[in-house]
């Protein structure tokens, strides 16, 4: 699998999408896992609803949500309030029994928040009548890794 890079800004939400063949993966639950080292296991972060018919419901684990459009064949993962420690290599998986097929390898990169370096006087804060409750703006910039690029930094 090629690795797709998704970039997000620290403190904001990042949306990762993983397309798949909806017929091939019909009836299968999906999962999002984090790769522990280059050759290490992929540690489950969150999986879709236990009832496949309800895969469209967003399922949360901490600040990570997963939802599956089983007809359209798109798995979507949202990382809310992205932090530097969220950077790393992940996988979208399709589950069958105790086995898991990789749908996409994803490298999450966290960019510094440019607002961090501004004076407080330049920042905009919502007024009393304004609410962010439903304003979950999700940003993602994605690209595929070039041949020869290494998703993990070399270990000394």
């Amino acid at each position: 699998h090629n690795t797709t890079v998704f970039q997000g800004v620290a403190g904001q939400s990042l949306q990762v999408s993983c397309p798949y063949d909806s017929m091939k993966h019909w009836g299968r639950r999906k999962a999002w896992c984090r790769q522990l080292g280059e050759k290490g296991p992929c540690q489950r972060v969150v999986s879709t609803h236990n009832l496949w018919l309800l895969s469209f419901l967003r399922r949360w684990n901490g600040s990570t949500a997963i939802t599956d459009d089983t007809l359209g064949g798109t798995l979507t993962i949202t990382l809310r309030n992205l932090q530097p420690h969220d950077a790393g290599l992940y996988q979208c998986q399709s589950l069958h029994g105790s086995e898991a097929d990789t749908l996409r390898k994803v490298l999450v990169e966290v960019l510094a928040d440019p607002l961090d370096h501004r004076d407080a006087g330049d920042l905009w804060f919502p007024g009393e009548s304004e609410s962010f409750e439903d304003a979950h703006v999700e940003h993602s910039i994605s690209r595929s890794l070039l041949e020869g690029e290494i998703p993990f930094p070399p270990t000394s």
């Epitope: 969150v46 236990n50 967003r58 949360w60 439903d134």
Partner: antibody, heavy 119, light 112 residues
Framework: QVQLQQSGADLLRPGVSVKISCKGS????????MHWVKQSHAESLEWIGV????????GYNQKFKGKATMTVDKSSSTAYLELARLTSEDSAIYYC????????????WGQGTSVTVSS | DVVMTQTPLTLSVTIGQPASFSCKSS???????????LNWLLRRPGQSPKRLIY???KLDSGVPDRFTGSGSGTDFTLKISRVEAEDLGVYYC?????????FGGGTKLEIK
């Protein structure tokens, strides 16, 4: 604290429709799906279905397809259940219940809305 | 649909004594993910239903530890080690392993 506030009791004639509301507060409304459950003397508790408060997508118990319609208004953090062509068999208490996170299904419940159908 | 059967219909218990509620399902509730989606809720008179236990044995926040849930496959039990007056109401089990979700008929706890 988490609260699900449902609309008041209704006494209705057969053949009409009714729309019950459930307003969520004390949490981020779009983070949790909303379930609807019917409680009648004859059938105890029955799951009607669930709606994603984020996308509006729905999943229905086959038994209630054509009878119940679930909708959501994100701007007011309110979920709705509409019941069509009411008969006496629809007389019941209807509850909304919030889907929890991960395997915490239906963690908070509304106080219930009583619907009585009588001519 | 999975049928959930609860026994007894009514349970009369003296304050301070234990109580035991039984719930049986027509199919195994063990999911392919290794979890068993069996839950218990209490409907007190004039109040909203309150979740007590989820995935067989996890206690909801604020639920006293005199409540315990156990079981596997098709047989499940809710136990109260020492019944208190606030425990009266109707106890329901329900399953979330198979579509659609289904509930038991309930067991009414009365205080002797």
């Amino acid at each position: 604290q988490v609260q699900l506030q449902q609309s008041g009791a209704d006494l209705l004639r057969p053949g009409v429709s009714v729309k019950i509301s459930c307003k969520g507060s004390g949490y981020t409304f779009t983070d949790h799906a909303m379930h609807w459950v019917k409680q009648s003397h004859a059938e105890s508790l029955e799951w009607i279905g669930v709606i994603s408060t984020y996308s509006g997508d729905t999943g229905y118990n086959q038994k209630f397809k054509g009878k119940a319609t679930m909708t959501v208004d994100k701007s007011s953090s309110t979920a709705y259940l509409e019941l069509a062509r009411l008969t006496s068999e629809d007389s019941a208490i209807y509850y909304c219940a919030r889907e929890g996170h991960y395997d915490d299904a239906m963690d908070y419940w509304g106080q219930g809305t009583s619907v009585t159908v009588s001519s | 649909d999975v049928v959930m059967t609860q026994t007894p219909l009514t349970l009369s218990v003296t304050i301070g004594q234990p109580a035991s509620f039984s719930c049986k399902s027509s199919q195994s509730l063990l999911d392919s993910d290794g979890k068993t989606y069996l839950n218990w809720l209490l409907r007190r008179p004039g109040q909203s239903p309150k979740r007590l236990i989820y995935v067989v044995s996890k206690l909801d926040s604020g639920v006293p530890d005199r409540f315990t849930g156990s079981g596997s496959g098709t047989d499940f039990t809710l136990k109260i080690s020492r019944v208190e007056a606030e425990d009266l109401g109707v106890y329901y089990c329900w399953q979330g392993t198979h579509f659609p979700y289904t509930f038991g008929g309930g067991t009414k706890l009365e205080i002797k």
